[in-house]
Amino acid sequence: MAFAPIPRITWEHREVHLVQFHEPDIYNYSALLLSEDKDTLYIGAREAVFAVNALNISEKQHEVYWKVSEDKKAKCAEKGKSKQTECLNYIRVLQPLSATSLYVCGTNAFQPACDHLNLTSFKFLGKNEDGKGRCPFDPAHSYTSVMVDGELYSGTSYNFLGSEPIISRNSSHSPLRTEYAIPWLNEPSFVFADVIRKSPDSPDGEDDRVYFFFTEVSVEYEFVFRVLIPRIARVCKGDQGGLRTLQKKWTSFLKARLICSRPDSGLVFNVLRDVFVLRSPGLKVPVFYALFTPQLNNVGLSAVCAYNLSTAEEVFSHGKYMQSTTVEQSHTKWVRYNGPVPKPRPGACIDSEARAANYTSSLNLPDKTLQFVKDHPLMDDSVTPIDNRPRLIKKDVNYTQIVVDRTQALDGTVYDVMFVSTDRGALHKAISLEHAVHIIEETQLFQDFEPVQTLLLSSKKGNRFVYAGSNSGVVQAPLAFCGKHGTCEDCVLARDPYCAWSPPTATCVALHQTESPSRGLIQEMSGDASVCPDKSKGSYRQHFFKHGGTAELKCSQKSNLARVFWKFQNGVLKAESPKYGLMGRKNLLIFNLSEGDSGVYQCLSEERVKNKTVFQVVAKHVLEVKVVPKPVVAPTLSVVQTEGSRIATKVLVASTQGSSPPTPAVQATSSGAITLPPKPAPTGTSCEPKIVINTVPQLHSEKTMYLKSSDNR
């Protein structure tokens, strides 16, 4: 599998409509929780929780502050921590508790605490529960949590130093935790947790299961340096611990290695960064997408692997276990266990088969089973990705977070659209197209190029958004910027399953998965732009320049995958020649203008899509070079003298749509100053005229004409 190509389009922060939320002096907007039924996004930041309108996050609905007392700050600072940064309250757990309350935990100046947030009054109830084991002490330490039926399952560190890792369930009737032992958890970096509900139709009447994802130091391999291993672990919701062995500890904790590597090379991605569980009505089994980087990542590599949940459960239900060995001078501490496995199977959830054998709860399990799972929490079998290879490998980028949306294109094909954020504040949108990856676009979410810490996807039909949290704020972006594709060709070449061209309105429209009719829309995920209707009108710009001056002819082509070249009177121009230059890789500069430079200039783009090359005329300019007698200015051009010898003209430019009235491109005012009109929103093939005013006195006027479509190809 080759590395993913560069994103086809790059949207700068200012180019697209992004909604932002941030409050002065509030940082670390790293906890996001979406309430779809209330259209509310809850944001946990440093010392504050906000509720904002999920459809427009700039609209703040509520806020509540949870600050650390000066006394606590001082005590924290005495222990060697920074009063300005570490000794504050970073919100780390933001989970739904009921329809009217949230469960919130914060680092609380290295004394983690939890409270209930009443959503009606938007005030904390002041419970001030001990957050130990639910929330890290140190804001720099890893953590994950999920609320399951009113009980919090967490993965974090249990002490001030962060040296004791724990996966626990906070429950009034049955609190459970992992053993503090290296075979169970070895310096883990927690990434994600989620619950997978039992299938009601399974013939085994099994339990709900909670999955944890983390990277830890390997116990299987011991080299000169520490080898990191990505893990998937799971516990059963019905686990109540053992009666004697594993009392108040998990009896169902099992973990396995996640494999994400490139089979044809030595590339192994062993540091887990984020996980997203994709659930969709069309999916028989949930799929989880995992984001990885290699351990030694000096080249900026990232990969995404997708896994069927059933593959992981198969490993836990039927796989072999690992056992520690005491072989001297061996790199491998742990080997496959081939001995007899006690019944009921160690680590298995209590199902109908176990119940039929009178094991109605984990408290009834025999000591042999419990002792075995205590000593063998690690599976020998690994969890392998779908198709045994990554979905995406990208060079020169460090991905941070991932969310995935399953959507249907016009032809009925289903695509898993991956939204992946970077450590430089960007968001990549990618799909798999016939065993190749197509990065549809890159959007710069954060102007300051800061890492995206959290990504969240709304699943409500109609208004769909991606929310991204960073140190400085939260950004809301639509799933697609269809309207930015100005022509049918651009819309089709985008190969965006959310977008289709609407010939009646001549716009690229978003295909919201609603019941609205899709008849007549054009979408071709192969990128075959020949399906686009012929343009009835092609426009060109007419320019008048003064002899000896320099002209810049604009060509706005957004595609990073396209090569732009210029034709003059149907011959291809060599931009490297002394006569011509390229500005910004696209705009044509013509130096030392003479009458011989008059004529038709065309900017064309050439883009490889699959095995086809698609050519587009992006812009067409008709240039006329005039020799102007020194003192005379033709009155018909309504030329206004400005600042000595510089000359400007009143220029009319017709709209490229051909329907709206002409708008002035450059307006010479009565005062003699030049005022530019408001710049139209740029589109994929916008072609604004440009006036170049040189030290050489120069005349440049322009207008837009129309050619028949046959001249436009």
């Epitope: 399974s202 085994d204 028989k284 949930p286 059933s310």
Partner: antibody, heavy 121, light 112 residues
Framework: EVKLVESGGGLVQPGGSLSLSCAAS????????MSWVRQPPGKALEWLGF??????????ECSASVKGRFTISRDNSQNILYLQMNALRAEDSATYYC????????????WGQGTSVTVSS | DVLMTQTPLSLPVSLGDQASISCRSS???????????LEWYLQKPGQSPKLLIY???NRFSGVPDRFSGSGSGTDFTLKINRVEAEDLGVYYC?????????FGGGTKLEIK
Amino acid sequence: EVKLVESGGGLVQPGGSLSLSCAASGFTFTDYYMSWVRQPPGKALEWLGFIRNKANGYTTECSASVKGRFTISRDNSQNILYLQMNALRAEDSATYYCATYGRLGYTMDYWGQGTSVTVSS
Amino acid sequence: DVLMTQTPLSLPVSLGDQASISCRSSQSIVHSNGNTYLEWYLQKPGQSPKLLIYKVSNRFSGVPDRFSGSGSGTDFTLKINRVEAEDLGVYYCFQGSHVPWTFGGGTKLEIK
């Protein structure tokens, strides 16, 4: 002893309706999913659908071939499973079986003897 | 829907021989809980089907140990060691992992 007895089969005209019953005994009826399976003469078995147990709200699943025409229901006080068949077609002619859906790792562990339905003008 | 394809359609054997029936699913029938609900049923002439094997390789109670099931993912096999007269009939594979549940087309085991 688990016993399932189907009844209600017979000859019906295309477009007509028929209701099949399955009387169950020997087990706690409300604890079990119940399935319907049919077999056209000389052909393979075809799963039609099931009705879930009490714990899962007695909701149903049906195969696409009968969805919208056939309805599965149950009378838990009488321990009877029903299959209401409407808009019958010639291709619905078959022997219809009811079966219990076991919860020990297997699906249809006990079957009735079947009842024959013929759709013909 | 998951399509179950059985081969052969008909299997003539001599009593005492070993018989092998294959079943292939159009997609993985591993349930989200990690189990594979692949079952084998035997239907004798004029009778209702009887469960033989569940979860790929587990024999149902009362089923003789000459019946064995194997396979994983999408490929499954039923083997009958030393075929006896009472084993004759039509064998069906069935998947109960993904709704709608589906049967194979059947394999008729008959005397050569």
